[in-house]
């Protein structure tokens, strides 16, 4: 039969709220060298126990009896400390354990999760979370909105998750946790109501250097919109703005619009250039989320200036004209040049030169026409740019280089003539 247990004092019980400090104690009486006392919690040896062992001899001789007291200190009681505690000693070839003591946690509910501050769009559903535990269980939750309970009694309404179908004003939410010991109140979460994301961002009109855009505002609850902000950013093909990418890769052009109307003219843009635009609207509570980036493009315009450095020389029945690309912005893709020449008493002749910047003209009448002048204009798909001032044909002087060019015969009828409104040519020779 087993030897009698050496334990003369067993651990007591501790029950308290979180954070409590307490001590478990066991005492044994042994003959000979005192053993090391180990503590078990739920059968597991506590390796990092905060324990102290005191040994008192009951006689003069080492082989006399000893009283051994082991104390286990529990600081700041937590749920992980709860369980059954025993002292354990190895004596010779035998193992002895004390009677168990119990450590329990009992107090006001303890929050594992509390509602968090957040922003939501007006009239948009969202969820809030709250979780609490005892012991003692059960723990019943009661949600409050702006300090008003959302249920008749704890445990009757929503518990861990509160579904809010939507708000039209900034509100506060908290939850109360109730158990047999009392009530704990969570932190108060502020739910800020922001305007909904604007919808249907679209182009109203396009000019080479400006775009007019409009959008439909989202709901903003009880808070009127104060303004909307529009951003435009140049979009190269390699730029990689995706529909939902949150930030543009370069500093955007930002404009503010007073509202209403929900419309804005964006100026100072580059012609014939792709952009991405987005809009957000702001109330006193803050800004809405941005719309997705919308790809837009400014149209081509006509060149803003005439070709430069026009020179025209005449040698008998031939005239050589050359010029340079306009210095002024082209506002699009240069498609070519138009040239017009006219004598004092002859009809104007219009020609499309294409992209060349020089031409040799074969003049009629063996060069007898007097006071010949030449004008040149550049054009894009949008139309003709301004014509140059008339340049008089100068007589060719020997020693001047005479380039060899394909001759362009002056037609007997003005086949190259264009309606004046088309080529914007209104000069008078």
């Amino acid at each position: 039969q087993a030897e009698e247990s050496p334990f003369v004092g067993n651990p007591g019980n501790i029950t308290g709220a979180r954070g409590l400090t307490g001590t478990l104690r066991c005492q044994l009486q042994v003959q000979g060298e005192p053993p090391e006392v180990h503590w078990l919690r739920d059968g597991q040896i506590l390796e990092l126990a905060d324990s102290t062992q005191t040994q008192v001899p009951l006689g003069e001789d080492e082989q006399d009896d000893w009283i051994v007291v082991s104390q286990l200190r529990i600081t700041s009681l937590q749920l992980s400390d709860t369980g059954q505690y025993q002292c354990l000693v190895f004596l010779g070839h035998q193992t002895f354990v004390s009677q168990p003591g119990y450590v329990g946690l009992e107090g006001l509910p303890y929050f594992l999760e509390e509602p968090e501050d957040r922003t939501v769009a007006a009239n948009t559903p969202f969820n809030l979370s709250c979780q609490a535990q005892g012991p003692p269980e059960p723990v019943d939750l009661l949600w409050l909105q702006d300090a008003v309970p959302l249920a008749t009694a704890p445990g009757h309404g929503p518990q861990r998750s509160l579904h809010v179908p939507g708000l039209n004003k900034t509100s506060s939410f908290s939850c109360e946790a109730h158990n047999a010991k009392g009530v704990t109140t969570s932190r108060t979460a502020t739910i800020t109501v922001l305007p909904q994301q604007p919808r249907n961002l679209h182009l109203v009109s396009r000019q080479p250097t400006e775009l007019e855009v409009a959008w439909t505002p989202g709901l903003s609850g009880i808070y009127p919109l104060t303004h909307c902000t529009l951003q435009a950013v140049l979009s190269d093909d390699g730029m990689g703005i995706q529909a939902g990418e949150p930030d543009p890769p370069e500093e955007p052009l930002t404009s503010q619009a007073s509202v209403p109307p929900h419309q804005l003219r964006l100026g100072s843009l580059h012609p014939h250039t792709p952009y991405h635009i987005r809009v957000a609207c702001t109330s006193s509570q803050g800004p809405s989320s941005w719309t997705h980036w919308l790809p837009v493009e400014t149209p081509e315009g006509v060149p803003l200036g005439p070709p430069e450095n026009i020179s025209a020389t005449r040698n008998g029945s031939q005239a050589f004209v050359h010029w340079q690309e306009p210095r002024a912005p082209l506002q699009g893709t240069l498609l070519g040049y138009r040239l017009a020449y006219q004598g004092q008493d002859t009809p104007e002749v219009l020609m499309d030169i294409g992209l060349r910047q020089e031409v040799t003209l074969e003049l009629q009448g063996d060069g007898s026409v007097s006071n010949l002048t030449v004008c040149v204009a550049a054009y894009t798909a949008a139309g003709d740019g301004p014509w140059s001032l008339p340049v008089p044909l100068e007589a060719w002087r020997p020693g001047q280089a005479q380039p060899v060019h394909q001759l362009v015969k002056e037609p007997s009828t003005p086949a190259f003539s264009w309606p004046h409104h088309h080529h914007h040519h209104h000069h008078h020779h």
Partner: antibody, heavy 116, light 106 residues
Framework: QVQLVQSGAEVKKPGASVKVSCKAS????????INWVKQAPGQGLEWIGW????????KYNEKFKGRVTLTVDTSISTAYMELSRLRSDDTAVYYC?????????WGQGTLVTVSS | EIVLTQSPATLSLSPGERATLSCSAS?????MYWYQQKPGQSPRSLIY???NLASGIPARFSGSGSGTDYTLTISSLEPEDFAVYYC?????????FGQGTKLEIK
């Protein structure tokens, strides 16, 4: 001296239940935890759970939770392990073992064979 | 859970030789325990609290180690020592065992 004596081998069909017993002697039965350990053929050892006979408190390995039930009858110093919804991979030797922070005494083992 | 890895899986030695069995834990533990199992028998406790000999275990067995690395040493092998040896931890739940080292006669 401490002794743990287990019940004999069992052959069961898949889906059935088995109840293995472990009779303790030579020490105060209610003071020490009784653990159960599984050893599949040619395999290592796997802890199933424990029961404290003094209170009936139990703790289970998550892997076995829901299919295993540990009980005791202190009047006859006997611990029981019941395993339900048996599957072929439950075929193993099941040991009871007394624990004092480790497994100091073991039963002789009970072979449970699950076969259709 | 803490995983215990024993090495070598098999150790072939002759009687009289020294045997060193290793057990490595996947995270730091406070104590290691060792068991011996012979074919057809139940495990038997050898070492507890890392270095203490269990009841009836001869002094040629010893244990050592700390943190993640632990060792069981048999100073001079006897014929009855050829068996499978398991290490075990209970620093964290659930208690786990190593996969075993088989000590066989060379």
């Amino acid at each position: 001296q401490v002794q743990l004596v287990q019940s004999g081998a069992e052959v069961k069909k898949p889906g059935a239940s088995v109840k293995v017993s472990c009779k303790a002697s030579g020490y105060p039965f209610t003071d020490f935890y009784i653990n159960w350990v599984k050893q599949a053929p040619g395999q290592g050892l796997e802890w199933i759970g424990w029961i404290y006979p003094g209170s009936g408190n139990t703790k289970y390995n998550e892997k076995f939770k829901g299919r295993v039930t540990l009980t005791v009858d202190t009047s006859i110093s006997t611990a029981y392990m019941e395993l339900s919804r048996l599957r072929s991979d439950d075929t193993a030797v099941y040991y009871c073992a007394r624990s004092t922070g480790f497994f100091d005494y073991w039963g002789q083992g009970t072979l449970v064979t699950v076969s259709s | 859970e803490i995983v215990l890895t024993q090495s070598p899986a098999t150790l072939s030695l002759s009687p009289g030789e020294r045997a060193t069995l290793s057990c490595s834990a996947s995270s730091s533990i406070g104590y290691m325990y060792w068991y011996q199992q012979k074919p057809g028998q139940s495990p038997r406790s050898l070492i507890y609290l890392t270095s203490n000999l269990a009841s009836g275990i001869p002094a040629r067995f010893s244990g050592s180690g700390s943190g993640t690395d632990y060792t069981l040493t048999i100073s001079s092998l006897e014929p009855e020592d050829f068996a499978v040896y398991y290490c075990q931890q209970w620093s964290s739940n659930p208690p786990t065992f190593g996969q075993g080292t088989k000590l066989e006669i060379k």
